[in-house]
């Protein structure tokens, strides 16, 4: 026996008050799949989320996270403040980057500058807050009285960041 | 969609060696870190270590260094979690986990299983 | 290293509330994390830094951080929310991530 509540297409509901007929969903309610007993409540974007895409009657709203923060998440269900390229987050807020360490996004921690000379190879260009070393040939291949123009990189251990 | 997918189960005797691995998809893997998680029978979580898939920098808890060797292959967006010689107590599902403080997606676990 | 301490076990009548809660040196100065992982699955975000609830979490949990404890809470518990809850922290001193040993929830009944 097919169940009457399957003929309910997406957008309303199997409303058993009034004899499993098909009724719309309430407003800020959705049903995304057909023979559904209710209606699902929309998701609201509030606070640190705005709306990317409405509520309607046959599919959830849609969130992404105010400029400043970005998503994490499935259907980016938290959002996480934004720091500046060169910095961390910490419960204090963005804090720089300890010399030594670099970050060259928006979010996430700062790591350590590559260590050249572990590769047996000299610092080309220096380590910022906000970019990694770059590692040039090993002091062997420069050319007689040549030498790196700066000092090596601290080793690749963690930073520490003030807290 | 964001998806982490792990190898799958395993059953090694001790000694032995093993490596497996923990593919993303759906995101830009070379840019979040990726962390391991072991969870022994009926016991709690415990933060492995970590990497940085863009460079391969690794961080490990003291609890595990030495012990296990993380790296990863950003062209093919895969981590993985490597022992040379493989102990009895190893034992356990693992985890892979986007982040380094909120871990955000998780891998279905792989179960490893060593005995004699 | 930071160590975290939760209770091994907390009991609650259903509709009750049920605090778990998570102890360590000032973790009030560093992010609490709080996941939730029911049998054969994945933990699950369910509390962010110390008292944000992802979309699609009940609004029944909350968190809070001060001090030495961070604490979940979960009001008018129910059936469902019967499962093991793991507090974490991200500590910038050692770079590491440390979880507490989980609190196994029972909702009575």
């Known amino acids: 026996l097919q169940d009457p509540c399957s003929k309910c297409p997406a957008g309303t509901f199997c409303d058993n008050n009034r004899n499993q007929i098909c009724s719309p969903c309430p407003p800020n309610s959705f049903s995304s799949t057909s023979g559904q007993k209710a209606c699902d409540i929309c998701r609201q974007c509030k606070g640190v989320f705005r709306t990317r895409k409405e509520c309607s009657s046959t599919s959830n709203a849609e969130c992404d996270c105010t400029p400043g923060f970005h998503c994490l998440g499935a259907g980016c269900s938290m959002c996480e403040q934004d720091c500046k390229q060169g910095q961390e987050l910490t419960k204090k807020g963005c804090k720089d980057c300890c010399f030594g360490t670099f970050n060259d996004q928006k979010r996430g921690i700062c790591r350590p500058w590559t260590n050249c000379s572990l590769d047996g190879k000299s610092v080309l260009v220096n380590g910022t807050k906000e970019r990694d070393v770059v590692c040039g040939p090993s002091p062997a291949d420069l050319s007689p009285g040549a030498s790196s123009v700066t000092p090596p990189a601290p080793a690749r251990e963690p930073g520490h960041s003030p807290q | 969609q964001v998806q982490l997918v792990q190898s799958g189960a395993e059953v090694k005797k001790p000694g032995e060696s093993l490596k497996i691995s923990c593919k993303g998809s759906?995101?830009?893997?070379?840019?979040?870190?990726i962390s391991w998680v072991r969870q022994m029978p009926g016991k709690g979580l415990e933060w492995m270590g970590k990497i940085y898939p863009g460079d391969s920098y690794t961080n490990y808890s003291p609890s595990f260094q030495g012990q296990v060797t993380i790296s990863a292959d950003k062209s093919i967006s895969t981590a993985y979690l490597q022992w040379s010689s493989l102990k009895a107590s190893d034992t356990a599902m693992y985890y892979c986990a986007r982040g380094y403080g909120i871990f955000d997606y998780w891998g279905q676990g792989t179960l490893v299983t060593v005995s004699s | 290293d930071i160590e975290l301490t939760q209770p091994p076990s907390v009991s609650v009548a259903p509709g009750q509330t049920a605090r778990i809660s998570c102890s360590g040196d000032n973790i009030g100065d560093q992010y609490a994390h709080w996941y939730q992982q029911k049998p054969g699955q994945a933990p699950v975000v369910v509390i962010y830094q110390d008292k944000n609830r992802p979309s699609g979490i009940p609004e029944r949990f909350s968190g809070s951080n001060s001090g030495n404890t961070a604490t979940l809470t979960i009001s008018g518990t129910q059936a469902e929310d019967e499962a093991d809850y793991y507090c974490s922290t991200y500590t910038f001193v050692g770079f590491t991530t440390v979880f507490g040993g989980g609190t196994k929830l029972t909702v009575l009944g």
């Open positions: 759906g995101y830009s893997f070379s840019t979040y870190w």
